[in-house]
């Protein structure tokens, strides 16, 4: 099917920037990694390079404004020709649940005392209101609450007093036309305006102002402008050579609005002065390779030593990574494929350990699924022997950092009856669903 | 190890109606993505349906669209295919199978591809005749 092709996807936003056209295949667009795609207008957009999982989006809003609950964020995978983690298609959202609260407590309702007395009237002739209020204090709301209905009301009050009504213009009438759209007629242009007394007029029992100033106001009518000539769009030039040496770009037509030139304010050319056409070199683009992630460490030895695990001998291990997804005379990745790092070993050492505190309350599991629940830990740490952290392995090499490696066999004394991991679970409040929030804006 | 049973195949005429059942042994069932595959002899194996979670969305192939609904009952560890208005060109065995990844995802791509399902039932056939 053909897509929209775009020269550029936003990382930030997700994107696609830099419309280039349609009508083209994905294979065609995705010539070169750099470009990005999408399948209808306004959908969602792809970029080019091999699939992955784009940022966390930000928590979505607490499923509940007061008290305990969830709130949901995801992620996508994102790119084209490939997968994420393995055997996620892109456009594929990931879900993560977790508990929430805004506000403690939920806001209570307090109740009214008695109204006070009136106010005197807002005016000394013709008709007014009066106002009275009341509290509320009776009881006094709690957490942000509020009492329902007015803490004020008003109703009519008359003086049995005439009042007086001065006089006010109402707003100027529109210019009258000028007698010619064009300068260098045989009469002198001119215009003008009106406005009455009549917002309001002034009364006669009693006697109002009259309104200040004059009624009528002429000028004369300046800066007209020669008649307007129309202008009009000479031929198309040349079509520019495609400007790129791989994938799709774009070549462009000029045109000049000179056939005539607009003169005396007269309208410019209708329409656009270039088109664009793509075009396709159908040559692939180079795509740089990219690290992998770094892998394991390698166990943690020492050259003709059987084992040096808890012992107080520094070894040596490695661990290694892989340039992927060079192709097209793409660049190399950059920097180590080998990292090496001295060590000593703890590989299955038994170990003194102590209780960590309680860790942060994790994720809610399943986040999407039936019952939720979040959980947090107290593990047996142990207590890493007291090895020099430095050593000069080699003359004049100076001193290097030690690790230790490995996974020691802690020994605690019981908690709860547990001996390496003691868990608390709790089940997640007012789940929200998890919805395709690019589903949504259809 | 966990085991997908389906059941609730057979013979039918067109315009007519199935309920296929998958029954899954294993207690974390509830938190498998459950899909539903067909193959019809000489083709390649085509997605049907998916029903991810209790609580997600649910995706149906444009063809099956409107006439096939998937459900599941977790108490019963239990994914259902109610197949109505057949049609001769529905008729395939019929695959039950889970994704027990850890991932909790939705997205068409996602479930449309076999990839992401780890455990398969052993097949139920579906016959439509004209």
């Known amino acids: 099917d053909p897509v929209l092709c775009f020269t550029q996807y936003e990382e930030s936003s997700g994107k696609c920037k830099g419309l280039l056209g349609g009508g083209v295949s994905v294979e065609d667009c995705c010539l070169n990694t750099a470009f990005a795609y999408q399948k209808r207008s306004g959908g969602l957009c792809q970029p080019c390079r091999s699939p992955r999982w784009s940022l966390w989006s930000t928590w979505a809003p607490c499923s509940v404004t007061c008290s305990e609950g969830s709130q949901l964020r995801y992620r996508r995978c994102v790119g084209w020709n490939g997968q994420c983690s393995g055997k996620v298609a892109p456009g594929t959202l990931e879900w993560q649940l977790q508990a929430c609260e805004d506000q403690q407590c939920c806001p209570e309702m307090g109740g009214w005392s008695g109204w006070g007395p009136w106010e005197p009237c807002s005016v000394t002739c013709s008709k007014g209101t009066r106002t009275r209020r009341r509290a509320c204090n009776h009881p006094a709301p709690k957490c942000g609450g509020h009492c329902p209905g007015q803490a004020q009301e008003s109703e009519a009050c008359d003086t049995q007093q005439v009042c007086p009504t001065h006089g006010a213009w109402a707003t100027w009438g529109p210019w009258t036309p000028c007698s010619a759209s064009c300068h260098g007629g045989p009469h002198e242009p001119k215009e003008t305006r009106s406005r009455k007394c009549s917002a309001p007029e002034p009364s006669q029992k009693p006697p109002g102002k009259p309104c200040p100033g004059l009624a009528y106001e002429q000028r004369r009518c300046t800066g007209l402008p020669p008649c307007p000539v129309a202008g009009g769009w000479g031929p198309w030039g040349p079509v520019s050579p495609c400007p790129v040496t791989c994938g799709l770009g774009q070549t462009m037509e000029q045109r000049t609005c000179n056939h005539p030139v607009p003169q005396h304010g007269g309208p410019f050319c209708a329409g656009d002065a270039t088109r664009t056409h793509i075009c396709n070199t159908a040559v692939p683009c180079p795509v740089d390779g990219e690290w992998d992630s770094w892998g394991e460490w390698s166990p943690c030895i020492r050259r003709n030593m059987k084992s040096i695990s808890c012992q107080e001998i520094p070894g040596q291990q490695s661990r290694g990574r892989t340039c992927r997804g060079r192709k097209f005379d793409g660049h190399r990745c950059a920097g180590q494929q080998q990292d090496i790092r001295h060590c000593y070993s703890i590989q299955h050492c038994p170990l003194k350990g102590s209780w960590s505190e309680w860790s942060t309350w994790g994720l809610c599991m399943p986040p999407c699924g039936p019952n939720p629940t979040r959980a947090r830990q107290r593990l047996c740490t142990p207590l890493l022997p007291k090895y020099p952290p430095t050593v000069s392995m080699v003359e004049g090499q100076g001193e290097k950092n030690v690790t230790f490696w490995g996974r020691p066999l802690p020994r605690c004394e019981e908690l709860q009856g547990q001996k390496l991991v003691v868990e608390e679970k709790r089940p997640c409040l007012h789940v929200p669903a998890c919805k395709d929030p690019e589903e949504e804006e259809l | 190890q966990v085991q997908l049973v389906e059941s609730g195949g057979g013979l039918v005429q067109a315009g007519g109606s199935l309920r296929l059942s998958c029954a899954a042994s294993g207690r974390t069932f509830s938190s498998y993505a459950m899909g539903w595959f067909r193959q019809a002899p000489g083709k390649e194996r085509e997605f049907v349906a998916a029903?991810?979670?209790?609580?997600?969305?649910?995706y149906y192939a444009d063809s099956v669209k409107g006439r096939f609904t998937i459900s599941r009952d977790d108490a019963k560890n239990t994914v259902y295919l109610q197949m109505n208005n057949l049609k001769p060109e529905d008729t395939a065995v019929y695959y039950c199978?889970?994704?027990?990844?850890?991932?909790?995802?939705?997205?068409?791509?996602?479930?449309?591809?076999?990839?992401?399902?780890?455990?398969w039932g052993q097949g139920t056939q579906v016959t439509v005749s004209g």
């Open positions: 029903v991810p979670w209790t609580y997600g969305s649910k």
């Open positions: 199978a889970a994704d027990s990844s850890a991932g909790y995802y939705s997205g068409f791509d996602y479930y449309s591809a076999a990839t992401p399902y780890d455990l």
